[in-house]
């Protein structure tokens, strides 16, 4: 392995998965590397093989149990190491003492559905997936709506500063096709980041009735 610029980032999904990405400039694509997890107060150790996701980055998931099982708590510390094979030995390339609830990234929201649609309005709901009960209501959401002729990047962000799993989109254009996405973030954790965006939900507003506006 070469001593290029390295980065090792991991996130806990709040239940039973730690996802890690390891990148190193100039590293060989066929280098064999793995992430090893060593908790301070659990009986298990876990390893996952880092698989290439781009020219200089690798990723893997430490699956700690059933998807909805609560495998770690706020007091856990998991020492994470990147180990890469160099000849007959393994070399430690990165190491961190990982506090799961300081490094959260939840799963993308699921089950998006149109509850009610009108000419200018649409009410949409969703669910959060594999989120810890520890959060209670301490979550926030961001949503965006894709209008015709625009890109997702141009879409203004709507912020929901509470655990609200629905939104009423207003000032929409009648008889128009839209797409909608939402993402979630716990309020807890210094290095916590937004979940991936949900799968887009396509919907169409109702056409305006002749002679009146509903």
């Amino acid at each position: 392995a070469v001593n290029g610029t390295s980065q090792f980032t991991c996130f806990y999904n709040s239940r039973a998965n730690i996802s890690c990405v390891w990148s190193q400039d100039g590293a060989l694509q066929d280098t064999s590397c793995q992430v090893h997890a060593w908790p301070d107060r659990r009986r298990w150790n876990q390893t996952c093989e880092l698989l290439p996701v781009s020219q200089a980055s690798w990723a893997c998931n430490l699956i700690l149990g059933a998807p909805d099982s609560q495998k770690l708590t706020t007091v856990d510390i998991v020492t994470l190491r990147v180990l890469c094979r160099e000849g007959v030995r393994w070399r430690v390339m990165a190491i961190q003492d990982f506090k799961p609830f300081e490094n959260l990234r939840l799963m993308a929201p699921i089950s998006l559905q149109v509850v009610h649609v009108e000419t200018h309005r649409c009410n949409i709901s969703w669910e959060i997936s594999q989120a810890s009960h520890y959060f209670e209501r301490h979550l926030e959401f961001e949503a965006r709506t894709l209008s015709p002729g625009h890109t997702w990047e141009e879409a203004p962000l709507l912020t929901l500063k509470q655990k609200q799993e629905w939104i009423c989109l207003e000032t929409l254009t009648p008889d128009t096709q839209y797409e909608f996405q939402v993402r979630v973030k716990p309020l807890q954790g210094e290095f916590t980041t937004w979940s991936p965006w949900s799968q887009p939900l396509a919907f169409r507003t109702k056409p305006a009735a002749l002679g009146k506006d509903t």
């Epitope: 392995a1 001593n3 610029t5 390295s6 090792f8 980032t9 060593w38 301070d40 510390i77 020492t79 190491r81 070399r91 430690v92 390339m93 990165a94 190491i95 961190q96 003492d97 990982f98 506090k99 300081e102 490094n103 210094e190 290095f191």
Partner: nanobody, 126 residues
């Protein structure tokens, strides 16, 4: 704002011991890996040792391995370097440094720090 203040340096005879301390403030200490680096007179910065956020991982430069011990007390927001069997070539200004995240990279341990203290002078006489 992030502050790192070293103390514990001084003049000591070869074979003696010193314990350096680094008081940290302005950030959640346990969330960051830390290190000690040193600068001898007329030389560049030399990495000495690194430690993970809860002390479960440590690394040392070959020149100090077996003589120096890095540790931390997260309740006191303090990093330590216990220096035993000191040699004249250990004479330097010693700095504590914070890595920019909870991670450090053993093959390139001098990289990735974002804050450093003002340093404390260690002089080892023969």
């Amino acid at each position: 704002q992030v502050q790192l203040v070293e103390s514990g340096g001084g003049l000591v005879q070869a074979g003696g011991s010193l314990r350096l301390s680094c008081a940290a403030s302005g950030f959640t200490f346990s969330n960051y890996a830390m290190s000690w680096v040193r600068q001898a007179p007329g030389k560049g910065l030399e990495w000495v040792s690194s430690i993970t956020g809860f002390g479960r991982g440590t690394d040392y430069a070959d020149s100090v391995k077996g003589r120096f011990t890095i540790s931390r007390d997260n309740a006191k927001n303090t990093l330590y370097l216990q220096m035993n069997s000191l040699k004249p070539e250990d004479t330097a200004v010693y700095y504590c440094a914070r890595y920019s995240s909870s991670t450090y990279y053993p093959p390139t341990p001098a990289r990735g720090t974002d804050y450093r203290g003002q340093g404390t002078q260690v002089t080892v006489s023969s």
